[in-house]
Interface confidence: medium
């Protein structure tokens, strides 16, 4: 299953399959997730080790048993790959690292006014993988405001150095934010020239293209089909690059197929997995396990559930079958691709779905009336769980926010439905940033069921929570995916990085905003909050957030939206925007429904709604 917990001051001993430099544990975990054999990782921050060569070291590890002995090492951070973690699987990494220089091949330098502009340049450059930016206070005047675009053979820095007034980060191409655009065309009977960066075996050109998309240095590819004249080159997928970023030449060639990486696509990237099953094909590789199952789909499920399994062959040979079950061969290789592909067999083959980010039809959890005032514009995909609840009758209007917590579930505030409890007047827009982008052709979800907390009463602030079941499940993308819920009764975690988002008013007597706003707000203790609201009862089922001096808060139109906090690199839904005295007033914090206190209720309702378990626990 999915394991998300991080182990502080711990280092996994042995099992090394690769090592690299990464700026933090979260990026190290992402590299582990996408490495075909990595199950565990250990990361050494700069503060944890004196050896300069091992600072920022990210060590990717494998283990036949799925675990390794942990040794104590102060400052080290260890954890698990996020394979099998559904929507949490993403190659997108937005963080900017201050005081850090990520080294690589500097291939472009320009003057820019901000680190955000530098990151944008990197994202819009086909070869850029990461960048460094020298701020205006950098010690050497001639380097100030320099934006260095970089790449490396492995896509990660060749070294990372602590350096004042330098900020570094990664290209946002894996976030589907590139302005370059992509070539979706597949070119039959055409071979591309240039530099081969890797060679793998694939059953078709589409798998080849997906592998190219997620390979750090692949810009285009050529695939040799299973009828290619040279037998030893059949099913070979050549991943390629060039100085210019495009093929310098192409040659008409029978039984070859060429195409481009889709990493530069805007708004949508292919999933990093291959779901197709190939009948009459055997995939060769190292044997992991053999099991008897009924049908090729069950064989694929078995492979997906066994975390080390990369691909499988389901044999229909009479000697491999007994009654209705046949042998399911679970296999792996060094690079995640078959070592041999044979056609015209009695088998069916395919890949593990462990890296598919659609996950199952569930809500995400972890084991362990009110625009934002004083906020700033959000960017695409920054808050992919945020939805807009709109009412359409004589006019269509944004009324509330909400949070996507599963393919078919949205969590919001009960008071959003005061006087409007009818599902057919509501439209739910997800995966949007700008309300003015909504046109008559913009897809929306309709409500199947509104579940208001049984103890909620109109005009009272208690139990202000409601679940929405959508009529049809949503697919997950970089711009539309769920937020994880906290553990039941989560009281021990101290959240220091919390944000409220919404399209609500920017001042008490304002209007709905077009661009989704965000504001960083500190949590306030319930005792402190109670002092500020002496006429109301602040219960343990509420959480408060705000600045003593005011100025930043949720406001009308943000109701039902998320208060999210980042902890151990993971966002969790801590609160639901509920109520407050005015907006952003001095010593009047915003009051939010505390989600952790309603976990039993959420579980009960999402499970009982259609009789099957809807909850998924990645930890």
């Amino acid at each position: 299953g999915c394991l998300t917990q991080l182990y502080e001051n711990a280092f996994f001993r042995g099992g090394d399959v690769a090592s690299m430099y990464t700026p933090n544990a979260q990026y190290c975990q992402m590299r582990c997730t996408f490495h075909p054999r990595c199950l565990l990782f250990s990361f050494l921050p700069a503060s944890s080790i004196n050896d300069m060569e091992k600072r920022f070291g990210c060590f990717l590890k494998d283990s036949v048993t799925g675990t390794l002995p942990k040794v104590h090492r102060t400052g080290a951070v260890s954890g698990h790959s996020l394979k099998q973690c559904g929507h949490q699987i993403s190659a997108c990494h937005r963080d900017i690292y201050k005081g850090v220089d990520m080294r690589g091949v500097n291939f472009n330098v320009s003057k820019v006014s901000s680190v955000e502009e530098c990151q944008k340049r990197c994202t819009s450059n086909i070869r850029c993988q990461f960048f460094s930016y020298a701020t205006q206070t950098f010690h050497k005047a001639e380097y100030r405001n320099n934006c260095l675009l970089k790449y490396s053979p492995g896509g990660t820095p060749t070294a990372i150095k602590v350096l004042s007034n330098v900020e570094s980060g990664f290209s946002l191409k894996p976030c589907a934010l590139s302005e370059i655009g992509c070539h979706m065309n597949i070119f039959q009977h055409l071979a591309f020239s240039d530099v081969d960066v890797a060679r793998v075996l694939t059953p078709d050109a589409f798998v080849c293209r997906t592998i190219c998309t997620y390979h750090p240095n692949c810009l285009f590819f050529t695939f040799y089909t299973n009828v290619w004249k040279i037998e030893s080159q059949r099913n070979v997928c050549l991943l390629k690059t060039s100085e210019s970023g495009t093929p310098s030449s192409s040659t008409p060639q029978e039984n070859t197929i060429s195409g481009y990486s889709l990493l530069t696509c805007k708004r949508t990237l292919p999933e990093p997995c291959h779901s197709k099953i190939y009948p009459g094909v055997d995939f060769g590789g190292e044997e992991l396990n053999v099991t008897f199952v009924k049908g090729v789909n069950v064989c694929q499920e078995t492979c997906t559930k066994m975390i080390r399994c990369q691909f499988f062959t389901y044999s229909l040979l009479p000697e491999d079958c007994k009654e209705e079950k046949c042998k399911c061969f679970l296999r792996l290789s060094m690079d995640g691709s078959p070592t041999r592909i044979a056609y015209g067999t009695q088998g069916s083959s395919g890949y593990s779905l462990r890296l598919c980010n659609t996950g199952d039809n569930s809500v995400c959890t972890t084991k362990t009336s009110t625009r934002i005032v004083g906020g700033t514009n959000s960017s695409w995909g920054e808050w992919p769980w945020q939805v807009s609840l709109q009412v359409k009758l004589t006019a269509q209007r944004h009324l509330c926010g909400g949070s996507l917590i599963g393919h078919q579930w949205v969590l919001t505030a009960a008071h959003c439905f005061d006087g409007l409890p009818l599902q057919d007047v509501w439209r739910i827009y997800s995966g949007i940033l700008n309300l003015s982008d909504i046109t008559k052709d913009t897809p929306f979800s309709q409500i199947k069921e509104i579940i208001i907390h049984q103890n909620y009463k109109v005009s009272e602030g208690n139990h202000d929570i409601a679940l929405i079941k959508l009529q049809a499940p949503l697919n997950y993308t970089e711009f539309q995916k769920p937020i994880c819920l906290p553990s039941k009764g989560d009281t021990s975690t101290i959240y220091t990085n919390c944000w409220v988002t919404g399209w609500g008013f920017s001042k008490e007597k304002g209007e709905i905003q077009n661009i989704l706003q965000k504001v960083n707000i500190p949590l306030v203790t319930n005792e402190e909050c109670q002092k500020r609201y002496q006429d109301y009862k602040i219960t343990q089922r509420m959480v408060c957030a705000g600045y003593k001096e005011g100025g930043k808060d949720a406001c009308k139109g943000d109701s039902g939206g998320p208060l999210v906090c980042k902890h151990n690199g993971m966002w969790r839904l801590v609160g639901i925007t509920s109520w407050g005295e005015g907006c952003a007033r001095r010593e009047q914090p915003g009051v939010y429904t505390k989600v952790a206190e309603y976990m039993d209720w959420i579980l009960e309702k999402t499970q009982s709604s259609d009789g099957k378990a809807q909850m998924q626990s990645p930890a």
Epitope: K392, L393, T394, A395, Q396, R397, L420, L422, D424, V425, S436, I438, T439, K440, D441, T442, E511, I512, N514
Partner: antibody, heavy 118, light 107 residues
């Protein structure tokens, strides 16, 4: 072809009642909001009433509140407007209209004339 | 209720002329504004929704602009079939309200 066809208009005395119908065809009636809009002779357009797809939620212009009732029968693909306590100022062509993906009324019927006069 | 004021209430123009009709809302309505064309004895027909989005099938000589309280409908080159009455309508809040209309006549 997407069509709306009104019927039920006519001459009625002040204080009298009339029931307008609007037959819909060519689209899935049950998923659309529906509205009545009227136009007095030589005057502009005035929204009268709207109803949600299931019929559970209705809204009215202040000028007709308490006198007019909008309803629908999704099994018959028909929208209704029950008009009671009619006044001379209710004299108008009554259109049923369907809003499109957002708010504009993109489909209109041909209209039915209601005359309130003694 | 939001009041919608159109100007002029009528205008005379020739075929080929550029015609501009303005519509002002009594409060900000963002871009929730639609334009309709109505010919005598006929039902209105939507031309533009969301202030500037041309309805499919409507000739490109029609265009809309504006945001907040001030909006414009422009006919770049008036054609014989364009002589009609034009209405703006806000869909920002209930009740939806229409302008009083602008009649475009042949000079």
């Amino acid at each position: 072809e997407v069509q709306l066809l009104e019927s039920g208009g006519g001459l009625v005395q002040p204080g009298g009642s009339l029931r307008l119908s609007c037959a819909a065809s060519g689209f899935t009636f049950s998923v659309y909001l529906m509205h009545w809009v009227r136009q007095a002779p030589g005057k502009g357009l005035e929204w009268v009433s709207g109803i949600s797809p299931s019929g559970g939620y209705t809204q009215y212009a202040d000028s007709v509140k308490g006198r007019f009732t909008i309803s629908r029968d999704n099994s018959k693909n028909t929208l209704y407007l029950q008009m009671n306590s009619l006044r001379a100022e209710d004299t108008a062509v009554y259109y049923c209209a369907r809003p499109g993906g957002l708010d504009a009324f993109d489909i209109w019927g041909q209209g039915t004339m209601v005359t309130v006069s003694s | 209720d939001i009041q919608m004021t159109q100007s002029p209430s009528s205008l005379s123009a020739s075929v080929g002329d550029r015609v501009t009709i303005t519509c002002r809302a009594s409060q900000s309505i963002n871009t929730y504004l639609n334009w309709y064309q109505q010919k005598p004895g006929k039902a209105p027909k939507v031309l533009i929704h969301a202030a500037s989005t041309l309805e499919s099938g409507v000739p490109s000589r029609f265009s809309g602009s504006g945001s907040g309280t001030d909006f414009t409908l422009t006919i770049s080159s008036l054609q014989p079939e364009d002589f009609a009455t034009y209405y703006c309508q806000q869909s920002y809040s209930t009740p939806p309200t229409f302008g009083q209309g602008t009649k475009v006549e042949i000079k």
